[in-house]
């Protein structure tokens, strides 16, 4: 059965998928599709990589991690209820019947309406992101509370720190990871 991930309308959703390249730069083609993994490849492709680079993508879908190191986790920007459903991450390992297939279920919940105090900006509105907790069960969505007014440089720095610390470390534990070679 599919592992379940959650996000709220307007946030970015994160669907983890990882593999370990046999050698640095020795990449494996990967495709992401909307819908369960079929017999081969991905149907309704939203993004794919080849042995060198991302060679196909559609708007709102991107790889935020370092795919050259095997982090092929999918970020879906500014999700709506229509983004709910099953997504396929397929790691196309060469050989006979070697592909690794992961079906991930994305559940989109309506945004919580919370009154914000005056003179404060909601950080998640400016930089929506889904943070996933460590563990083996369904991932929980954490939303960041409001922060006082800060300038764009500070927001950018904070966003980078969040991405680098929480996403690079915590999310790796809850994603599908395989080693190649």
């Amino acid at each position: 059965s599919e592992v379940e991930y959650r996000a709220e309308v307007g946030q970015n959703a994160y669907l983890p998928c990882f593999y370990t390249p046999a050698a640095p730069g020795n990449l494996v083609p990967v495709c992401w599709g909307k819908g369960a993994c079929p017999v081969f490849e991905c149907g309704n492709v939203v993004l794919r990589t080849d042995e060198r680079d991302v060679n196909y993508w559609t708007s709102r879908y991107w790889l935020n991690g370092d795919f050259r190191k095997g982090d092929v986790s999918l970020t879906i920007e500014n999700v709506t209820l229509a983004d709910s459903g099953i997504y396929c991450c397929r790691i196309q390992i060469p050989g006979i019947m070697n592909d690794e297939k992961f079906n991930l279920k994305l559940v989109i919940k309506p945004a919580k309406v919370t009154p914000a105090p005056t003179r404060q900006r909601d950080f998640t509105a400016a930089f929506p992101r889904m943070l996933t907790t460590r563990g083996h069960g369904p991932a929980e969505t954490q939303t960041l509370g409001s922060l006082p007014d800060i300038n764009l440089t500070q927001i950018s720095t904070l966003a980078n720190e969040l991405r680098d610390s929480r996403l690079a470390n915590d999310l790796r534990d809850s994603g599908a990871t395989i080693r190649i070679g």
């Epitope: 599709g33 819908g35 369960a36 079929p38 017999v39 081969f40 490849e41 991905c42 149907g43 309704n44 492709v45 196909y56 196309q92 060469p94 050989g95 006979i96 019947m97 070697n98 592909d99």
Partner: antibody, heavy 123, light 108 residues
């Protein structure tokens, strides 16, 4: 024009092997997957497996695993299907069929078929 | 394995009539992964419909496909003499790829 030309009819004895070829022309050979499908006399269609002509991915139907081998030769744009340990139930017409998945199209369908190769297994 | 059951087994109609062919899957199939083929005696199959409802190149618009989940339909709005053949549905959703047993469309 796009076409798939298969090798000629074969008559084999039970226990033998048969190797059927399928030569592609009129398109970029390595851009499209190739299926093998068979049809016993008066029966329906049965999928045997699929090969990515880049050579990096092959999937066999479980029913044929261990008996079927699919290979390709990019220099001649040809795919091959070898079936071993033949029995009378393997008497059928064997088709290669290109899947039009790829080249920016991410739907599935066997859009070009070979003319078929009749394999008769008889003692 | 996903079993596709086609009905009716044989359909007898006259040219000009409307034909409705059914394909039922033993478990849900994404519409993206369903196709229909036509086969005439002594010939290879021909792709008619992919993605449950998209016509393949060169297929006349009297052929249409619909459905989702476990129930799919191929409709031929006005039968032409060349449409009498065997029709197969096929799924790509899970291995092995499977075909229905076929519906024979014959002239009444």
């Amino acid at each position: 024009q796009v076409q798939l030309v298969q090798s000629g009819a074969e008559v084999k004895k039970p226990g033998a092997s048969v190797k059927v070829s399928c030569k592609a022309s009129g398109y970029t050979f390595t851009s499209y997957y190739m299926h093998w499908v068979r049809q016993a006399p008066g029966q329906g269609l049965e999928w045997m497996g699929i090969i990515n002509p880049r050579g990096d991915s092959i999937i066999y139907a479980q029913k044929f695993q261990g008996r079927v081998t699919m290979t390709r030769d990019t220099s001649t744009s040809t795919v091959y299907m070898e079936l071993s340990s033949l029995r009378s139930e393997d008497t059928a017409v064997y088709y290669c069929a290109r899947d039009f998945y790829g080249s920016g199209n991410y739907y599935y369908g066997m859009d070009v078929w070979g003319q078929g190769t009749t394999v008769t297994v008889s003692s | 394995e996903i079993v596709l059951t086609q009905s009716p087994g044989t359909l007898s109609l006259s040219p000009g009539e409307r034909a409705t062919l059914s394909c039922r899957a033993s478990q849900s199939v994404s519409s993206s992964y369903l196709a229909w083929y036509q086969q005439k005696p002594g010939q290879a199959p021909r792709l008619l419909i992919y993605g449950a409802s998209s016509r393949a190149t060169g297929i006349p618009d009297r052929f249409s496909g619909s459905g989702s989940g476990t129930d799919f339909t191929l409709t031929i709005s006005r039968l032409e003499p060349e449409d009498f053949a065997v029709y197969y549905c096929q799924q790509y959703g899970s291995s092995p790829i499977t075909f229905g047993q076929g519906t024979r469309l014959e002239i009444k």
